[in-house]
Amino acid sequence: MRTEAQVPALQPPEPGLEGAMGHRTLVLPWVLLTLCVTAGTPEVWVQVRMEATELSSFTIRCGFLGSGSISLVTVSWGGPNGAGGTTLAVLHPERGIRQWAPARQARWETQSSISLILEGSGASSPCANTTFCCKFASFPEGSWEACGSLPPSSDPGLSAPPTPAPILRADLAGILGVSGVLLFGCVYLLHLLRRHKHRPAPRLQPSRTSPQAPRARAWAPSQASQAALHVPYATINTSCRPATLDTAHPHGGPSWWASLPTHAAHRPQGPAAWASTPIPARGSFVSVENGLYAQAGERPPHTGPGLTLFPDPRGPRAMEGPLGVR
């Protein structure tokens, strides 16, 4: 989910503040301030619905909420793409759409959301506890993936309420540098602001909201579809293995769809940073698909319970893979 820090406004320095200190307090905070306020973590939402008329028919909708341009969407079932899931569809914003059974119809709904109708009879048909995953490749954020499934208790024709954080997978290769700089910048900015509090000038006007209190937005599908994002392609993986995600944590929301937004409430500085980040709500897990490890040919270390690091199987040209390949 996107987080926006409400940062206090800086007043102009009082007369007499000059030299290096003046430049530093003027220019740097403004640059960092801009970065901090505009920096938002992308979010992927997934909605799963079982059709009342056909018990083996599912409709999956996925969307990307971020500032980057989408280069590819991959939909799969049975787990995250590249981690044992079955690829169902690949959607590129300009090159086209490819889908494989049991996917029946994949389509772009908006520039940042896609839908996929699945139907099947026999071995390839989805079942109620199937986990569906949508992976969005975007620039400069990297790859973000969310997974979700209908809870076993769901009635046909209805869908579960939105769940907390499902799977979050990010290709750190593309975002590590930016994230690190932004994180450092924001911390440094806060440090500067704190120092200014104890100085007579410049004065700091208290803000209406706490500078460190991020504001969470709840994105409904209708809102998501309005995001003017360019999604290159989507892949959906599905399988009838036990569902990876526990969707039984109601958060309200549309009664018709199971809406599964990913909440990316942190910006990792590196693989080690994930070990100290809070683990999401029960029944969910966070994983990172790290292109850096993949390029180095190493498997990233396991960083702790509930936290798994997956190397990016696509290699150095990941951004043009099923994401951007014709």
Partner: antibody
């Protein structure tokens, strides 16, 4: 660099079957699907079907559904197309292409002759 | 199936001339969700596999000279070569990328006058 290697030629007798290969290198095989295209001498291009290494259910052009069988072997990064009950109508150049068609093999010339 | 019809079937041009060729589809190739047209253009020289020139009706593939321009929407599309070079002599195919089965046009053969 990305390469799709296909045997240059295959000569088979009518009624027999042939299994053409397309060995991929220079990219992550599991990240792209493989498309097969037929071109008869002096004619245009015909889409046969495509298969994704992450899905065992290929797509087929109805015209080729009973003629072609597409498979992949991820361990060797190779895609295969088996053509059965061959006739002279099957004599053509068969291409494999990666993903959206940004890379193509050089093609295998299939000659069906007794 | 979506039928792709190309015209003319052949073109004779002199080097340096501007040339345009047409491709019409039996159904719209416009994706209403993102307003993109899913049509590709390929160039095929004798004895070689096809080479992707244009995708999304108007986006040049990496490495393709800017003298090649794709345009059009819905069912009518055009490939323009602003100044034909000797190496451009080939057969040009349009391809439906909108839905299965993927279908190719009949081709336009570009010959030297």
């Amino acid at each position: 660099q990305v390469q799709l290697q296909q045997p240059g030629a295959e000569l088979v007798k009518p009624g027999a079957s042939v299994n053409m290969s397309c060995k991929a290198s220079g990219y992550t095989f599991s990240s792209y699907w493989i498309t097969w295209v037929k071109q008869r001498p002096g004619q245009g291009l015909e889409w046969i079907g495509d298969i994704h290494p992450g899905n065992t259910s290929p797509n087929y052009n109805e015209k080729f559904r009973t003629k072609a069988t597409l498979t992949v072997d991820t361990s060797s990064s190779t895609a295969y197309m088996q053509l059965s009950s061959l006739t002279s109508e099957d004599s053509a150049v068969y291409y494999c292409a990666r993903g959206w068609g940004d890379y193509w093999g050089q093609g295998t010339t299939l000659t069906v002759s007794s | 199936d979506i039928v792709m019809t190309q015209s003319p079937s052949s073109l004779s041009v002199a080097a340096g001339e501007k040339v345009t060729m047409s491709c019409k589809s039996s159904q719209s190739l416009l994706n209403s969700g993102n307003q993109k047209n899913y049509l590709a253009w390929y160039q095929q020289k004798p004895g070689q596999p096809p080479k992707l020139l244009i995708y999304g009706a108007s986006t040049r593939e990496s490495g393709v000279p800017d003298r090649f321009t794709g345009s059009g929407s819905g069912t009518d599309f055009t490939l323009t070569i602003s100044s034909v070079q000797a190496e451009d002599l080939a057969v040009y195919y349009c391809q439906n990328d909108h839905g299965y089965p993927l279908t190719f046009g009949t081709g336009t053969k570009l010959e030297l006058k």
